[in-house]
């Protein structure tokens, strides 16, 4: 007798150990940017602060009728998902509601400014301990609202926020495009994108993870002791907050990074049905939904990663896509997708003292995308190696030749235009262990690395015969960490990480072209990191 | 998302001297003006004047102060709504669109977004 | 069938704490569909609801007792108690234990005081 | 916190006899009211719940109307084991009851 949300998101380990801990004990506080609230309900009573802060338009509408329980209905239903007695997930949470939606559910940019202000100033006045911030709101894109969470963000509160229910690119709005912000899309109870009407969920690479959104049953503003169901990507965004205050009451010390990366790497992989999105969308879409992760206690020293992708970079002929991992993530490699094929590759560069992975767009092509894979390496020094363009024939090679350095990542830049005299870049485990090796007119880029324990090795996989994609994965125990495609057709669209997966894309056309021995070759780089050992490189 | 996607940035043709006060026409103005895509969710005559990073506390009060000057100069009132220090410098005003050239100009501006709704999702 | 039984002193002293224990048979307490609820009636008048509690413990008190009440629960017993500090004569009732539907799972049935104990009758005299 | 008054105190009828019973809230409560029977030395038993829904087991001859603040139940035909105090509770904010209407033998 549990609601299908949390059963879904709270493994039948983790609800005994929730059913032992007694509530209010968590020093985690929720901050809840939403409408009104009704604290008496039974769910929240007694864990709720309602405070003054209160900064909504009016309503529209001569003949509106400002009535209570309508009013407090989407905030109720929220506060109750995160932190209810019986239907939330983070049961006894201390949650701090700040009004920043009407009764018609309406606020401002501004207005939402404020609020996260109001947070700000209740830090600096009195600070405690971990912040979890909530924002089931969605504007158009807002450079300001974006900059204020990204300000928020770095003072160590976690803001978690809703995609949008707009069946769009979640970057084309706000705060959900921010990328400091934890962007939660909706499935539902049979783990596919949630459908509303003739809208739905948002989609996309600002989306960081899905999370229940349909038919929630939680806290109704009707009475007391009323439940509702209520769908959105309001309420995902609810389950995730539960999750993280979860995670931050066992672990105060979590990270934003960390938080995210666990959050990532624990979800529930590859349930979700991407034909729902728009084709151009499924690449970008995470296919990923939350559930509570076990405790750093329980899985220490792994290394995790995750795949960011860049914006597109538009079809001009110097057209570059930027990539950027979060200040605390290491970026490991750099990759580019181009759905043409039309692309110059790929390089790592450092801007304003942060790495950052570029990829450059080929004259004719339709525009390119960089693919960042960040990770949490503790106590890593990492270094770029790059070798210009070999002349015509010749292969460049780069490996790392720092002591104790391992490589990570490689990226490959052509400086010619002409996509039929170059081959594609190889990366040569066998004859050359730890070497980045690229063919005419390539610029190679080795990502090195130093830390504790971090030992790599390459693995590589090809097909011969006709096919759109070739994969590679890192086995258990092993996080990707780099990918590439090796030589083959003479037009391959790229290559991109999904979350331990390598895969290389191979444009149609090419298929046909092929003679059976040209083989495609996707090659990932495969990491582990073993405290106790040394930093290594496997063969 | 580093890029401002589906967004609108306008720059402002703005004439170098609009009413001979030498301390305006010294300053160019190279902050823009942003508002939401959505033409149905904007909020015209409210604006969020953002300014430099390091914009000291008393300057941001000097900004908005300064607006508030200037467009009383030229017959216009405008209300200084909220100031913001702690998350970032900035203010919100309430004033006509026909102020945003000389809010602009202003030292220290960074750039101005129209304000526009949020809508519980 | 669900039944519940209340048990305690049937005197206690002004001043004192009331006691009191429900035992649940027929069902487990151990579910997240109800609350556990104390509710009074004092002799010749209408009833009161105390508080209520779920099997995880959390409570949910009268805003005009909370001061005094406390309700707990032992899963491993089946059974919830009440205690009621500083008591007056004005707390003689006959108090009742009851289940309700805590409604966060619609199937378990309407949101209400259903069944009831029978109750039992609580003197506060010296 | 929301009072419930119910009228009449005593209602004096014959088995056979058709009970209207009222309750009124001092605010609205929207359908959230349930009747209650309680007979002497027993615990009180769910008739009505959400002002119309009639509980498991409870003869039809029990109906039960309203919303908002004014409530009605009615036992359309008096058996001589309706003769009880009934009362009325609401679940819009806490759990309030009223003080009881007695419905006697005449």
């Known amino acids: 007798s549990i609601p299908w949300n949390l059963e879904r998101i709270i493994p039948a380990w983790h609800q005994t150990e929730e059913d032992r801990s007694p509530d209010g004990s968590s020093q985690v506080e929720v901050y809840l940017l939403d409408t009104s609230i009704q604290g008496a309900h039974r769910e929240i009573e007694g864990r709720v602060t309602i405070t003054d802060f209160n900064s909504v338009p009016e309503e529209d509408g001569t003949r509106f009728h400002r009535q209570a329980s309508k009013c407090d209905s989407h905030g109720t239903h929220l506060a109750g998902v995160v932190s209810g007695r019986d239907a939330g997930v983070a049961k006894g949470t201390s949650l701090h509601s700040l009004r920043v939606l009407n009764c018609q559910g309406k606020g401002t940019v501004s207005g939402t400014l404020i609020g996260l202000e109001f947070i700000r100033k209740s830090q600096l006045i009195q600070p405690s301990g971990p912040l979890v911030v909530l924002l089931p709101l969605a504007g158009g894109y807002s450079r300001i609202l974006n900059a204020a969470c990204r300000h928020l963000a770095r003072t160590g509160v976690v803001l978690v926020a809703a995609a949008g229910n707009f069946r769009d690119d979640a970057c084309l709005y706000s705060p959900a495009s921010a990328p400091e912000v934890i962007t939660v899309g909706a499935t539902n109870a049979q783990d596919q994108p949630v459908t509303l009407g003739t809208l739905g969920t948002n989609f996309g690479r600002c989306v960081d993870l899905f999370a229940p959104g349909k038919d929630i049953i939680g806290a109704s503003s009707d009475c007391s002791t009323c439940f509702m169901s209520q769908s959105g990507t309001s309420q995902a965004a609810a389950h995730v907050a539960g999750i993280v205050a979860r995670m931050l009451s066992r672990e105060p010390t979590l990270t934003l990074a960390e938080l995210r990366q666990r959050l990532i790497h624990f979800s529930t992989k590859d349930v979700i049905n991407m034909a729902w999105f728009p084709e151009d969308q499924q690449v970008l879409t995470p296919n990923l939904v939350a559930t509570l992760p076990p405790s750093t206690h329980e899985t220490g020293g792994q290394l995790l990663c995750r795949t960011v992708w860049s914006a597109h970079s538009g079809p001009t002929r110097t057209a570059t896509a930027t990539a950027r991992c979060a200040p605390e993530e290491e970026l490991l490699s750099c990759s580019s997708f181009s759905r043409s094929g039309r692309r110059r590759g790929d390089w790592i560069e450092a801007i304003g003292g942060q790495q950052v992975c570029k990829a450059l767009n080929a004259f004719g092509g339709e525009g390119v995308y960089a693919v960042a894979r960040c990770c949490l390496v503790p106590r890593a020094n990492c270094s770029i190696h790059n070798t210009p363009a070999a002349r015509a024939g010749l292969e460049t090679h780069v490996h790392c030749h720092q002591k104790d350095h391992v490589l990570t990542g490689c990226s490959f830049h052509w400086e010619v235009e002409d996509l039929s005299v170059r081959r594609q870049p190889a990366l040569r485990s066998r004859r050359q262990p730890g070497q980045c090796v690229g063919h005419q007119a390539a610029s190679v880029y080795a990502s090195c690395c130093h830390a504790p324990g971090l030992e790599c090795k390459i693995k590589e996989h090809g097909i011969s015969g006709p096919s759109e994609q070739v994969t590679v994965a890192c086995e258990a125990g092993w996080t990707l960490t780099g990918c590439n495609v090796l030589p083959g057709a003479s037009l391959t669209l790229g290559a991109y990480s999904v979350d331990n997966l390598c895969v290389a894309r191979v444009h149609d056309t090419a298929r046909a072209d092929r003679t059976s021995g040209e083989a495609t070759v996707a090659a990932a780089i495969c990491c582990r990191s073993r405290p106790s050992a040394k930093a290594s490189w496997v063969q | 998302q580093d890029e401002d996607g589906d967004y609108e940035e306008l720059m402002l043709a703005l004439p170098s001297q609009e009413d001979g006060l030498a301390d305006e026409a010294a300053h160019v103005a190279t902050a823009t003006f942003r508002r939401c895509s959505k033409e149905a969710w904007r909020l015209p005559g409210t604006y969020i004047v953002v300014l430099m990073e390091e914009t000291q506390r008393l300057q941001i009060e000097q900004t908005a102060h300064r607006l508030q000057t200037r467009a009383a100069r030229r017959g216009y009132v405008i209300k200084v709504l909220h100031i913001f220090y702690d998350l970032f410098p900035g203010f919100l005003v309430k004033m006509s669109s026909d102020l945003l050239g000389l809010a602009l100009k202003l030292p220290h501006v960074e750039y101005i977004e129209e304000d526009s709704f949020v809508f519980a999702q | 069938q669900l039944q519940l039984q209340e048990s305690g002193p049937g005197l206690v002293k002004p001043s004192e704490t009331l006691s009191l224990t429900c035992t649940v048979s027929?069902?487990?307490?151990?579910?997240?569909?109800?609350?556990w609820t104390w509710i009074r009636q004092p002799p010749g008048k209408g009833l009161e609801w105390i508080g209520s509690?779920?099997?995880?413990?959390?409570?949910y008190y009268n805003p005009s007792l909370k001061s005094r009440v406390t309700i707990s629960v032992d899963t491993s017993k089946n059974q919830f108690s009440l205690k009621l500090s500083s008591v007056t004569a004005a707390d003689t009732a006959v108090y009742y234990c009851?289940?309700?539907?805590?409604?966060?799972?619609?199937?378990?049935?309407?949101?209400?005081?259903?069944?009831w104990g029978q109750g039992t009758l609580v003197t506060v005299s010296s | 916190e929301i009072v419930l008054t119910q009228s009449p105190a005593t209602l004096s009828l014959s088995p056979g006899e058709r009970a209207t019973l009222s309750c009124r809230a001092s605010?609205?409560?929207?359908?959230?009211l349930a009747w209650y029977q309680q007979k002497p030395g027993q615990a009180p038993r769910l008739l009505i719940y959400?002002?119309?829904n009639r509980a498991t087991g409870i003869p039809a001859r029990f109906s039960g109307s309203g919303s908002g603040t004014d409530f009605t139940l009615t036992i359309s035909s008096l058996e001589p084991e309706d003769f009880a105090v009934y009362y009325c509770?609401?679940?819009?904010?806490?759990?309030?009851f009223g003080g009881g209407t007695k419905v006697e033998i005449k």
């Open positions: 009851a289940r309700e539907n805590s409604g966060v799972v619609p199937a378990a049935g309407p949101n209400w005081f259903d069944p």
């Open positions: 959400d002002a119309s």
């Open positions: 509770q609401q679940r819009r904010n806490w759990f309030t």
């Open positions: 605010q609205s409560v929207s359908s959230y």
């Open positions: 509690i779920n099997y995880r413990g959390s409570t």
């Open positions: 027929g069902g487990s307490i151990w579910s997240s569909s109800y609350y």
